[in-house]
């Protein structure tokens, strides 16, 4: 039976007469698209999220839903509107036959339709001989309140709120949206139903084994007793949080999503909207030993995505699988054998493993940071999490070879104190998706809305690329990398920084065609060079060698190949000062690095010369890495010589402001 409502027939009759008065046609030239989960077993055909265009009002959403019902009824199909979305995304959730998709896609205001799909808890119960205590304990860094100014929302299973670890700390909301458990003989046992959520609530704010002991939590039930939920249920949960935030604005909000499903455009869009409303979202990278970008909400750029490591800082193996990895992961955190509240009794504890536990650690750290500095934006918080992480401690050999360069080698840690970070110029590296191998393929890397793109570089494993450039897109600079003929594809790498009151622009010099090579500098008064990029149209730049060292007294200048156009990123910001640091190796080498010294932050990373045997340049923390083709293929000719060029900046203004605060 498609519909349980007795008044269904009446509704259809009422709508049939209404339908013809709704003759708005979809706008010309825009076609709504249909999306579904790439993982077949996780698909839930028969339930669809119809997402409407951004400015659609609630009344229009309701009208569009009614129109769909009326048109479906005319064709003899039953439909049921399960939910009308507003507050986060305009749209509605409908139960209907897949035969109606074509019809639904033609409705006015429709942007896209997504078939519902499953999401899953990301923890593995683990048998232990010995239990390792959580590696980062809250007593290492405790603001007076331990996160008390922050509210953490947990979207998970039901929880045992009277457990001694979380009693009085977790408010169970009346929100519940879960699918039926699988299997006819499934026996609902309270302790099993509450297992996942209780443990995670304990990891975040548990009285004795929690990270942010002062944080208060609110739980929403979106996962059933088997740890399974739906994209639509999660969306409705996120909408509930947004509405709660609007009704009763409180202090900083952290939302913990310890779940994962297949890539979902709509779930990512909802996360983006909530993040832009000032909410910090933290999610599990997923336990599939796979690229996190293939899963949601892990793949949403606005969400802080957390992979799992063990006490030895190694990626966590979970049975035959393990932690996800890749460019969509922001950082890793302890996620193996984590002790937390067990729902078996109010004084029971259990060890669980997974990226859910890792995400709970980061949610706790975020709550503590926000409690100490409630005004932090999402971008500032993310940058601080990265800055205070333990660097280069993960054994990258565990990751597939093609993912090693893309995966951040960062393990979350609590800041040593609540002060002293304000003066720092924070930057992070953002990798694009792979461009694909076609001749004209490009890849784009973007910074978060309140970050500045200070430099742009590119990387190709085959070395066949045509460089990169910074360009304006929607009023913001983006970093675009270009593939070359015969290339297997490129990555664009953006260096994204927090630079308040910055005014940045890109200065370009076209190919010089002269023997001296191409040069460009920052000519505006008070503007300093933060990054250099070069882009060329020719397939192979050849062996022309420009002068590697720039002339004395020209620090504000980018130098490049005569056949390439050179782009300088020039910024003006209070107290900003930058310097160029180069490290050249005369003999060919697969990797050349140059690092900025203590107190300076790497903003730009590029290679000289830009010839085709250079695979590209990218920043890893405060080090500029230039990769070249295997030495054996280049030979030891002078062409093999490569220089890594780092641009290191600091902000005297931020330092002074910080000193004044203390």
């Amino acid at each position: 039976q498609e519909d349980e409502d007795g008044d269904y027939e009446e509704l259809v009759l009422a709508l049939r007469s209404e339908e013809d008065g709704l003759a708005e046609a979809p706008e010309h030239g825009t076609t709504a698209t249909f999306h579904r989960c790439a993982k077949d077993p996780w698909r839930l055909p028969g339930t669809y999220v119809v997402v409407l265009k951004e400015e659609t009002h609630l009344s229009q959403s309701e009208r569009t839903a009614r129109r769909l019902q009326a048109q479906a009824a005319r064709r003899g199909y039953l439909t049921k509107i399960l939910h009308v979305f507003h507050g986060l995304l305009p749209g509605f959730l409908v139960k209907m036959s897949g035969d109606l998709l074509e019809l639904a896609l033609k409705l006015p205001h429709v942007d896209y339709i997504e078939e519902d799909s499953s999401v899953f808890a990301q923890s593995i119960p683990w048998n232990l001989e010995r239990i390792t205590p959580p590696r980062y304990r809250a007593d290492e860094y405790q603001p007076p309140d331990g996160g008390s100014l922050v509210e953490v929302y947990l979207l998970d299973t039901s929880i045992q709120s009277d457990h001694r670890e979380i009693e009085g700390r977790v408010m169970v909301t009346d929100f519940e949206n879960v699918p039926e458990e699988d299997g006819t003989r499934f026996h609902r046992q309270a302790s099993k139903c509450d297992s996942h959520g209780t443990h995670l609530a304990g990891v975040v704010s548990g009285r004795d084994a929690g990270v942010a002991k002062g944080a208060s939590m609110r739980s929403l039930r979106v996962l059933n007793c088997q740890g399974k939920g739906t994209v639509s249920g999660t969306l409705i949960g996120l909408e509930f949080i947004r509405k709660s935030q609007l009704v009763q604005p409180v202090g900083p909000l952290v939302v913990l999503l310890p779940l994962a499903g297949g890539y979902s455009r709509v779930l990512n869009a909802a996360c983006q909207r909530l993040a832009r409303a000032g909410v910090v979202l933290v999610t599990a990278a997923g336990n599939f030993r796979d690229d996190a970008c293939l899963y949601s909400p892990a793949s949403a750029p606005e969400v802080i995505t957390v992979g799992a490591t063990n006490a030895q800082d190694q990626p966590v193996t979970l049975g035959t699988l393990g932690t996800n990895f890749g460019r969509c992961v922001d950082l890793f955190a302890p996620g193996e054998d984590i002790i937390g509240a067990s729902s078996d009794c109010s004084t029971c504890f259990v060890s669980q493993s997974g990226t859910s536990q890792a995400a709970a650690h980061v949610a706790g750290i975020a709550a503590m940071m926000l409690s100490a500095e409630p005004e932090l934006t999402l971008a500032e918080l993310r940058q601080r999490l990265i800055h205070f992480s333990a660097k280069d401690v993960i054994n990258e050999a565990w990751f597939p070879e093609d993912q090693r360069v893309l995966t951040p080698n960062l393990v979350a840690a609590l800041p040593p104190s609540t002060h002293g970070a304000g003066w720092q110029l924070f930057c992070r590296t953002v990798w694009s998706a792979h461009s694909g191998p076609t001749r004209m393929a490009t890849a784009v890397a973007r910074c978060a809305p309140d970050e500045e793109l200070l430099s742009c570089s590119s990387f190709s494993r085959s070395g066949k690329r045509r460089g990169e450039r910074m360009e304006a897109q929607g009023g913001k600079l983006v970093c675009r990398a270009h593939n070359a003929f015969g290339g297997e594809g490129v990555y664009a790498i953006a260096r994204c920084c927090l630079l308040p009151q910055a005014n940045c622009s890109v200065h370009t010099a076209p190919p010089a065609e002269a023997s001296m090579g191409t040069r460009v500098h920052c000519h505006q008064q008070g503007h300093v060079l933060t990054g250099c990029s070069s882009h060329w149209e020719v397939e192979d730049l050849g062996t022309h060698k420009p002068p590697v060292l720039r002339p004395r007294g020209q620090p504000n200048q980018c130098v490049g190949h005569r056949e390439a156009s050179i782009h300088a990123s020039c910024c003006h910001a209070p107290g900003l000062e930058c310097k160029v640091k180069e490290h050249g190796i005369p003999a060919p080498q697969e990797q050349v690095t140059v690092a900025c010294e203590e107190g300076w932050t790497l903003t730009g990373c590029s290679a000289l010369p830009g010839t085709s045997h250079v695979l590209g340049a990218y920043a890893v923390d405060n080090t500029c890495v230039v990769r070249s083709r295997d030495v054996s293929t280049t030979g030891s000719t002078s062409e093999g010589a490569v220089t890594a060029v780092a641009i290191c900046c600091r902000s005297r203004h931020l330092a002074q402001a910080s000193q004044e605060l203390q």
């Epitope: 002790i339 078996d344 004084t347 029971c348 060890s351």
Partner: antibody, heavy 131, light 106 residues
């Protein structure tokens, strides 16, 4: 049978700290979960907190949170209780007592049940707080 | 925290009497209750655990019953060495003790 031997009586000034020790003999110390219970003169018993060696965490009663620290040294089979910011009402006999950490196998997990059943007690340490 | 209320707070009895002490929990604690005996200047001694299980070495004249919120300790025939203070203690959550019942010689 586990024997618990506590350190001697202490006289402390208000605002200072006291650290009482409890040495276990008989049985494996690693399996000894130790709680601390105090009794003010003429009053009843009050649980302060416990150390759970297998779990690697200490649990504290809400009332004492932030003021009490319970630790254990496996090498000497000794548990410690430190109480800071002492006031006159902290004058009491402080007992260490062994409780249990019971392992329950459920759903492929090892669940640890903190069973606060005190079968073995130390002789008690009188702490007097007076100016 | 779970509150434990003992009654009576004191009682006078003679050797050979049957004595009953009750303990009430502020919320259901299943059978997570222990009974202790304490003599002046000494540490408490465990008599009954899990509501009704006699600790080894404890005479069989001691028995415990109840579950949920209401519990009882019974001494079937009071002996001279039984004059002491008795405490109930729950362990369903953080351990809390009753205020004690003093058993005195009539």
């Amino acid at each position: 049978q586990v024997q618990l031997v506590q350190s001697g009586a202490e006289v402390k000034k208000p605002g200072s700290s006291v650290k009482v020790s409890c040495k276990a003999s008989g049985g494996t110390f690693n399996s000894h979960a130790i709680s601390w219970v105090r009794q003010a003169p003429g009053q009843g018993l009050e649980w302060m907190g416990g150390i759970n060696p297998i779990l690697g965490i200490a649990n504290y009663a809400q009332k004492f949170q932030g003021r009490v620290t319970i630790t254990a040294d496996e090498s000497t089979s000794t548990a410690y209780m430190e109480l800071s910011s002492l006031r006159s009402e902290d004058t009491a006999v402080y007992y260490c007592a062994r409780h249990y950490e019971i392992q329950i196998g459920r759903y492929g997990m090892n669940v640890y049940y903190l069973m606060y059943r005190f079968a073995s007690w130390g002789q008690g340490t009188l702490v007097t707080v007076s100016s | 925290d779970i509150q434990m209320t003992q009654s009576p707070s004191s009682l006078s009895a003679s050797v050979g009497d049957r004595v009953t002490i009750t303990c009430r929990a502020s919320q259901g604690i299943r059978s997570a209750l222990n009974w202790y005996q304490q003599k002046p200047g000494k540490a408490p001694k465990l008599l009954i655990y899990n509501g009704s299980t006699l600790q080894s070495g404890v005479p069989s004249r001691f028995s415990g019953s109840g579950s949920g919120t209401d519990f009882t300790l019974t001494i079937s025939s009071l002996q001279p060495e039984d004059f002491a203070v008795y405490y109930c203690q729950q362990f369903d959550g953080d351990p809390t003790f009753g205020q004690g019942t003093k058993v005195e010689i009539k």
